[in-house]
């Protein structure tokens, strides 16, 4: 299963779309910066088997998809870009699911790393809480967009390391 190669390309396309989605100047949003506590340690370890690593990436993409599929998100972002972004994420999720099924027969380790997936879930809960507290303001969404771009970039490094391990 050559997921890391195809996923890396999808990740790049998703990042480009995210970059294009900006609606307001981020310079007006500096005071809205927030520490979401990206679970870096979950993307640092080499302890993962491939299926486990993919399941953590899958959770991150799934949570991002959920976040940008809300009605508040639809009211904020330009519709055609949002649709392209959602389609790209959906394709990545499908690719990952197919890949995990393939890997199950190859590995004897557990399919999921429960602690890592929980850490990713909590990270997105903090993002959602921040948006709620900021009443889904344009600046709050701008900060979240920047954070998601950063987390995608950090997970890209993780994917590249995964590819080198193969």
């Amino acid at each position: 299963c050559d997921l890391p190669q195809t996923h890396s390309l999808g990740n790049r396309r998703a990042l480009i779309l995210l970059a294009q989605m900006g609606r307001i100047s981020p310079f007006s949003c500096l005071k809205d910066r927030h520490d979401f506590g990206f679970p870096q340690e979950e993307f640092d370890g080499n302890q993962f088997q491939k299926a486990q690593a993919i399941s953590v990436l899958h959770e991150m993409i799934q949570q991002t998809f959920n976040l940008f599929s809300t009605k508040d998100s639809s009211a904020t972002w330009e519709q055609s870009l949002l649709e392209k972004f959602s389609t790209e994420l959906n394709q990545q999720l499908n690719d990952m699911e197919a890949c995990v099924i393939q890997e199950v027969g190859v590995e004897e380790t557990p399919l999921m790393n429960v602690d890592s997936i929980l850490a990713v879930k909590k990270y997105f809960q903090r993002i959602t809480l921040y948006l709620t507290e900021k009443k889904y303001s344009p600046c709050a969404w701008e900060v979240v967009r920047a954070e998601i771009m950063r987390s995608f970039s950090l997970s890209k490094i993780f994917q590249e390391r995964l590819r080198r391990k193969e």
Epitope: P26, L30, R33, A146, M149
Partner: antibody, heavy 121, light 107 residues
Framework: EVQLVQSGAEVKKPGESLKISCKGS????????IGWVRQMPGKGLEWMGI????????AYSPSFQGQVTISADKSISTAYLQWSSLKASDTAMYYC??????????????WGQGTLVTVSS | DIQMTQSPSSLSASVGDRVTITCRAS??????LNWYQQKPGKAPKLLIY???SLQSGVPSRFSGSGSGTDFTLTISSLQPEDFATYYC?????????FGQGTKVEIK
């Protein structure tokens, strides 16, 4: 290794134009903003302005608005600071530094080595 | 614009001394404050960001505290290489502004 490398020292006459550069390497150039800071001889640090290289959006300090222009060419990972008509009072050391934008990360964590601009008739 | 006022503007201290520099903002900036060290002829170096986070590679004798309008940079035991000028900078809103600097000299 993250690096910001600035162009060399310049000696100019009043009224001349100038464009100095700051080339980033070792990181994703469009993921960080680039700020410019002035330091006049024997004085403190003054923030001039900033650019988001991903879309060339800029913000200036009111003290420098209209006096300088900040630009970037993301294809060569380079930011620029330019003057159309230099004054003797522009004599200073100019630094570029990277800024994490809206991300919760260290501000101005890497700096260029500085470009000394001397304006004298 | 947010004004940043540092005190003292200069101080004399000996190796091993505990040194404290303060920075006051003209309005609340939450914890959006950075501290830089600059030596003659060199670019500034980030020491502390978001008021109290130690930048990677910076010795633990440097620490920062404060929130709102009042902030402090502390050097717990001054070393020979710490004689320099220190600047605070608010990163709460544009235009970004620096304090006027505090020069730490050898007594």
């Amino acid at each position: 290794e993250v690096q910001l490398v600035q162009s060399g020292a310049e000696v100019k006459k009043p009224g001349e134009s100038l464009k100095i550069s700051c080339k980033g390497s070792g990181y994703s150039f469009t993921s960080y903003w680039i700020g410019w800071v002035r330091q006049m001889p024997g004085k403190g640090l003054e923030w001039m302005g900033i650019i988001d290289p991903s879309d060339s959006d800029t913000a200036y300090s009111p003290s420098f608005q209209g006096q300088v222009t900040i630009s970037a060419d993301k294809s060569i990972s380079t930011a620029y600071l330019q003057w159309s008509s230099l004054k003797a009072s522009d004599t200073a050391m100019y630094y570029c530094a990277r800024h994490p934008g809206l991300n919760w990360a260290p501000d101005f964590d890497y700096w260029g080595q500085g470009t000394l601009v001397t304006v004298s008739s | 614009d947010i004004q940043m006022t540092q005190s003292p503007s200069s101080l004399s201290a000996s190796v091993g001394d505990r040194v404290t520099i303060t920075c006051r903002a003209s309005q609340s900036i939450d914890g959006s404050l950075n501290w830089y060290q600059q030596k003659p002829g060199k670019a500034p170096k980030l020491l502390i960001y978001f008021a109290s986070s130690l930048q990677s590679g910076v010795p633990s004798r440097f620490s920062g505290s404060g929130s709102g309008t009042d902030f402090t940079l502390t050097i717990s035991s001054l070393q020979p290489e710490d004689f320099a000028t220190y600047y605070c900078q608010q990163s709460y809103d544009f235009p970004l502004t620096f304090g006027q600097g505090t020069k730490v000299e050898i007594k």
